[in-house]
Amino acid sequence: EEELQMIQPEKLLLVTVGKTATLHCTVTSLLPVGPVLWFRGVGPGRELIYNQKEGHFPRVTTVSDLTKRNNMDFSIRISSITPADVGTYYCVKFRKGSPENVEFKSGPGTEMALGAKPSAPVVLGPAARTTPEHTVSFTCESHGFSPRDITLKWFKNGNELSDFQTNVDPTGQSVAYSIRSTARVVLDPWDVRSQVICEVAHVTLQGDPLRGTANLSEAIRVPPTLEVTQQPMRVGNQVNVTCQVRKFYPQSLQLTWSENGNVCQRETASTLTENKDGTYNWTSWFLVNISDQRDDVVLTCQVKHDGQLAVSKRLALEVTVHQKDQSSDATP
């Protein structure tokens, strides 16, 4: 035998203060004839929330047209939610009777609780830059959410990270909660263009998580590699020497040339180029005046990158009438 069912699909409805809450109730039969009323709570002390036939309920509106003979949707909207509205709401079918209607069947109830959205996650990286293959820590914080259940995930360039620790405070009952998570990320040489993302999912966000991001360009230092070479062609009594500084980040770089230990003050030609991975290349050309009577010349290209200790590379020019082989070595 078919029987009327009262369907209240949500067991729990989280609402925000000041917003409108929709409480769903549908029936599967037009029989027995009689109204559907809404109550908060159960038993003799229950509070009437909505009765289509009588009473004044200024904050309550119906979703559907209840005057329609075939209406099966008795959902209501309650506007301007306040903390006083929390509780369990029941839609109840009454059978038409004389002298008064008789309760026939109740829905399972929907608990209305106050929810608060988490704030936009803020991601902070390390205070100082670190070189590739080292581990850096990023923190993510979000505040002011309720209920306590929350999900936080970390991503690097879309790939989920697993090395992180998360705390939600306080541990006991509270009006609102905060989350703090620390992720450990191993830096790769190509991470200049990488991003870490902290993603927070909460029931109040209705499946649309909040994200906070940090650029690894703020956390990484890619040290340069140096190469000093002598151009094979000689123009008169000048030799062109090139210092190539490759694959460094950030851009902050000081380059000085020394000739036999003496720092050269004169202008040198240079170019800066950016690589696809976000690192930079710097090329500096140095013209050395030579003569047949001159002693051997040792050129040093010294680079100070991002405030770190200087690195240098030397090139010995053994200058004779017939130019001999070149040799080079590096010093820290």
């Epitope: 035998e1 078919e2 009327l4 769903h24 549908t26 599967t28 039969s29 037009l30 029989l31 004839v33 979703v63 559907s64 047209d65 329609k68 003979r69 075939n70 209406n71 099966m72 949707d73 959902s75």
Partner: antibody, heavy 119, light 107 residues
Framework: QVQLQESGPGLVKPSQTLSLTCTVS??????????WAWIRQHPGKGLEWIGY???????YYNPSLKSRVTISVDTSKNQFSLKLSSVTAADTAVYYC???????????WGQGTTVTVSS | DIQMTQSPSSLSASVGDRVTITCQAS??????LNWYQQKPGKAPKLLIY???NLATGVPSRFSGSGSGTDFTFTISSLQPEDIATYYC?????????FGGGTKVEIK
Amino acid sequence: QVQLQESGPGLVKPSQTLSLTCTVSGGSISSGGDYWAWIRQHPGKGLEWIGYIYPSGFTYYNPSLKSRVTISVDTSKNQFSLKLSSVTAADTAVYYCAREGYHSGMDVWGQGTTVTVSS
Amino acid sequence: DIQMTQSPSSLSASVGDRVTITCQASQDISNYLNWYQQKPGKAPKLLIYDASNLATGVPSRFSGSGSGTDFTFTISSLQPEDIATYYCQQFAYLPWTFGGGTKVEIK
């Protein structure tokens, strides 16, 4: 007066999803508080009620099809749609959209569209 | 689901005859019953709603009666244009269900 027009592919491969749209003209889908239904009729057979939707989003599907059916409404386009997943030859039928009016009867129908499920 | 049993499944009558179709519900559906006419290759058309009310524009030779589980649909004087299949439909309990149909032919 209100008119309904079904549209969608006439041939669907087995295991795929059947998708039909019903366009409402001559009135607003959301103004009258009507239910919007889908009904089908197998070749040479009777009528089978698939389900309906109210503009508020309330839906009810025939339990015999419930796991495979989705009915949705797009009030901006004045349309409602039917999706039936994992179709088999048994889903070959004429599909009708209809309005369930104030007096509960389905008083406006589309002309019907034949859908054949075959590879 | 509510079962709707329609009888007869087909009938043949002469023009001007009184034609009666019955529909029985598997349980009490009050007067939540509709009758439809479907001509070959066409969509169904609502004739009677709420068991006995004539839909707009439907000729008065069509009528319906009944309540509870037993319902009757009558064509007081059969016309050639009445050749069709007739269906009852309950809307007391979801899902809505139809009777198997009665095919009416002219002798």
